[in-house]
């Protein structure tokens, strides 16, 4: 019998300084691009090598970004979210939700709709 897979959800404030090539990550999600079932949130899909986010080290693929400089990312179209990041200025504060997989029992599996999959 499979063990149950639970998730430990934590939030973190990450302050990034925009580098020469920007913030250094990609996003998916939005009300018109649901990446996770029944969730129109914005998720990190790629951390660029040697970019600002990678050098900081805290932002991870699969993280959900809740806000940028205090502005909520709920109910945004995908391109509007992209534009929000692009216009966020030099110092960028991200409120991020990390979701860590915690396995209970002998066999775990990644759930359908897991953003890190």
């Amino acid at each position: 019998m499979n063990g149950r897979v639970d998730y430990l959800v934590t939030e973190e404030e990450i302050n990034l300084t925009r580098g020469p090539s920007g913030l250094g990550f990609n996003i998916v999600g939005g009300t018109d691009q649901q990446y996770v079932s029944n969730d129109s949130g914005i998720y990190v899909s790629r951390i660029k090598e040697n970019g600002a986010a990678a050098l900081d080290g805290r932002l991870q693929e699969g993280d959900k970004i809740l806000s940028v400089n205090g502005q909520d990312l709920k109910n945004l179209l995908h391109q509007d979210a992209v534009d929000l990041f692009r216009n966020a200025g030099y110092a960028v504060s991200l409120r991020v939700q990390h979701r860590l997989q915690v396995q209970n029992g002998p066999i775990g599996h990644r759930g359908e709709g897991d953003p890190s999959g």
Partner: nanobody, 126 residues
Framework: HVQLVESGGGLVQAGGSLRLSCTAS????????MAWFRQAPGKEREFVAA??????YYADSVKGRFTISRDNAKNTMYLQMNSLKPEDTAVYIC?????????????????????WGQGTQVTVSS
Amino acid sequence: HVQLVESGGGLVQAGGSLRLSCTASGRTFSTYTMAWFRQAPGKEREFVAAITWSGTYYADSVKGRFTISRDNAKNTMYLQMNSLKPEDTAVYICAAVIGSTVDSYSPSDPLEYDYWGQGTQVTVSS
């Protein structure tokens, strides 16, 4: 991991047409930013066209002749190539990355993409 497989290449006469396809694995194809590059023997890899969530981009050399498109239901991107010229002869390679960059997008920069296909040969004879 995303796998990309190109098809549709071949030999065509100048002035003719071809349609290339790039089929991708993965359940979130609609979120991919995708591009076509080409490489002729002894030359650098050259950007051809790209398609993002918000629009399309073309190299000046193919503008008005080539059209990039996608069918999310089929996990496939296309390159319709019309009015082909001998100088279009090359291996055509598709590239992809998951999501949209939050930085300024440079479609012709290979570092924008994480995944690459093996390519399909296009030969245009005069």
